[in-house]
C-alpha cells in the first residue's frame, strides 16, 4: 500500500535569481486533487494554500512581492490529498541578485580565438566576497563555480566552437546572494578544423532572456522556460 | 627559456612559392597557438593567420586566405607557413608569434625576398 | 575589421623627458590593447599587455592606460636605449590588427 504520494515539482517564476526588491513567484506542482500545499523555507513551514476546486488544480504559487536577502535560500513543497502527503519537493534554491557590487568579466587570450586555443575567463570583484560564478546563455547547463579573494580563474581549456557565446559572472556573498551581473563578454571561436569531430553549438536565447535559460533535467520539460536549473541548483549546495 | 627559431633567408620567383618554418622551444607547443605576422621592408606589421596546434584549427587573414598555410607539427613542435603565388610586394620579413595573450614571444625573423 | 590608428607617426623627445604615445581603435576592444617596441633588424618586443598589465622583464618606466577605443602608452623617462618604433595590436578579434607605429626618435 502506497504510503506516500509522487513529489511535487518546485520552481521559480521567472527565474530562481531574483533582482533584490524584484517580484517572484514560487511555484509547486502536485496532483489534481490535492487538497493542501505547503511550502517549506530552509525546513521550517512558510506558507499553506488550498486550492479551490482541488480536483481542477494541480498547481499553487506562493508569490514574493519583494526578494531581499532573508527571502534567499532553499525551498521545498509538499502537497496533500485526502490525509496522504507527497513526498517533498527537490530543494528550489532561491538566489537574491543585484546585491553591492558589478564584477568584471574578461577572458584571455582574447574575446576571439582559434578552435583548441585555452581559454581562461576572468571574473574580478573589489568587495569581498570569495566565491564566484561562471554562466554561459544557452539551453544547456554552463554554470561553473570559482574560488579567489578578489578575482576567480575559470579555465575552459581547449575550445571548440560549442564554447561559442555568451557569458557573465557573479560574485556570491554567500550561497544565495550574489552580486550584479557581470557585463556580457561573448566569446567567438574561429578555425577550420580538419579530421576533427567538434561539439555541435548550443541554441541560444537572446540576450535579453538570459536569465531564462535554465532547464531542468529532472523533467526535460520546459515550463514556461522557468523550471529551475538542476545543474545550477546542486553547484549551490 | 621560450625560444622560436625560424628557418633561413629565401629568394624567390614570382609565381612560385615559399614554406617558412618555426620549431619552438621551453614550452608546451601544443598549449599556444602560433601566429604569423609579416613586415615589408619600411612597413608596419601585419598579422597573416595563426594555428592551433593541438587540434590545428586555423584562422586567416582575409587579405591571404587562399593563398597561405598555416601548418604545425607537434612531433617536432615546428610550426610552418606556406605562402603561394608570390609576388614582389610579398618581400618582407616573416615572423612567427606565441600568442599568449599578446604575442608574448617572437622568432627571429625570415626574409622573403620574391624578385624575378 | 578593427582599424588601429596611431599617432603621432614621429615624435622627438629629448632624453630623461616622457614620452606619450597614442592608439585609437575604431571600434571598442576593452582593454584588449598591446603594445610592442621594435628596433631595426629586430623582432618586435611585447611591453605592455592588456592596456595596462606590466610584462617581466620590462623597465618600470613603460606603462599604459586606456580602455575601450583610446589608449596611451607612456615612457616616464627616456633612456637611450627606447628610442625605436612602437606598435599597438588590437588583441580582440580577428583579422588581430597593428597601428602604423610611432617613431620615436631623439630631439
Known amino acids: 500500500q502506497q504510503q506516500t504520494l509522487p513529489k511535487p515539482f518546485i520552481w521559480a517564476e521567472p527565474h530562481f535569481m531574483v533582482p533584490k526588491e524584484k517580484q517572484v513567484t514560487i511555484c509547486c506542482q502536485g496532483n489534481y486533487g490535492a487538497v493542501e500545499y505547503q511550502l517549506h523555507f530552509e525546513g521550517s513551514l512558510f506558507a499553506v494554500d488550498r486550492p479551490k476546486p482541488p480536483e481542477r488544480i494541480n498547481k499553487v504559487q506562493f508569490y514574493i512581492p519583494d526578494m531581499n536577502s532573508r527571502m534567499a535560500g532553499q525551498y521545498s513543497c509538499i502537497y496533500r490529498v485526502g490525509e496522504l502527503w507527497s513526498e517533498p519537493s527537490n530543494l528550489l534554491d532561491l538566489v537574491v541578485t543585484e546585491m553591492y557590487d558589478t564584477p568584471t568579466l574578461s577572458v584571455h587570450p582574447g574575446p576571439e580565438v582559434i578552435s583548441g586555443e585555452k581559454v581562461t575567463f576572468y571574473c574580478r570583484l573589489d568587495t569581498a566576497t570569495s566565491m564566484f560564478l561562471l554562466l554561459k546563455e544557452g539551453r544547456s547547463s554552463h554554470v561553473q563555480r570559482g574560488y579567489g579573494k578578489v578575482q576567480a580563474e575559470f579555465p575552459l581549456g581547449p575550445v571548440t566552437t560549442a564554447h561559442r557565446g555568451t557569458y557573465r559572472c557573479f560574485g556570491s556573498y554567500n550561497n544565495h546572494a550574489w552580486s550584479f551581473p557581470s557585463e556580457p563578454v561573448k566569446l567567438l571561436v574561429t578555425g577550420d578544423i580538419e579530421n576533427t569531430s567538434l561539439a555541435p553549438e548550443d541554441p541560444t536565447f537572446p540576450a535579453d532572456t538570459w536569465g531564462t535559460y535554465l532547464l531542468t533535467t529532472e523533467t526535460g520539460l520546459q515550463k514556461d522556460h522557468a523550471l529551475w536549473d538542476h545543474t545550477a541548483q546542486n553547484l549551490l549546495r | 627559456q621560450v625560444q622560436l627559431v625560424q628557418s633561413g633567408a629565401e629568394v624567390k620567383k614570382p609565381g612560385s612559392s615559399v614554406k617558412v618554418s618555426c620549431k619552438a622551444s621551453g614550452y608546451t607547443f601544443s598549449e599556444y597557438t602560433m601566429h604569423w605576422v609579416r613586415q615589408a621592408p619600411g612597413q608596419g606589421l601585419e598579422w597573416m593567420g595563426g594555428?592551433?596546434?593541438?587540434?590545428?584549427?586555423?584562422s586567416y587573414n582575409q587579405k591571404f586566405k587562399g593563398r597561405v598555410t598555416i601548418t604545425a607539427d607537434k612531433s617536432t613542435s615546428t610550426a610552418y607557413m606556406e605562402l603561394s603565388s608570390l609576388r614582389s610586394e610579398d618581400t618582407a620579413v616573416y615572423y612567427c608569434?606565441?600568442?599568449?595573450?599578446?604575442?608574448?614571444?617572437w622568432g627571429q625573423g625570415t626574409t622573403v625576398t620574391v624578385s624575378s | 575589421e578593427i582599424v588601429m590608428t596611431q599617432s603621432p607617426a614621429t615624435l622627438s623627445v629629448s632624453p630623461g623627458e616622457r614620452a606619450t604615445l597614442s592608439c585609437r581603435a575604431s571600434?571598442?576592444?576593452?582593454?584588449?590593447l598591446h603594445w610592442y617596441q621594435q628596433k631595426p633588424g629586430q623582432a618586435p618586443r611585447l611591453l605592455i599587455k592588456?592596456?595596462?598589465q606590466s610584462i617581466s622583464g620590462i623597465p618600470a618606466r613603460f606603462s599604459g592606460s586606456g580602455s575601450g577605443t583610446d589608449f596611451t602608452l607612456t615612457i616616464s623617462s627616456l633612456e637611450p636605449e627606447d628610442f625605436a618604433v612602437y606598435y599597438c595590436q588590437n588583441g580582440h578579434s580577428f583579422p588581430l590588427t597593428f597601428g602604423q607605429g610611432t617613431k620615436l626618435e631623439i630631439k
Open positions: 571600434q571598442s576592444i576593452s582593454d584588449y
Open positions: 592588456y592596456a595596462s
Open positions: 594555428i592551433s596546434p593541438n587540434i590545428g584549427g586555423t
Open positions: 608569434a606565441r600568442r599568449g595573450g599578446s604575442f608574448d614571444y
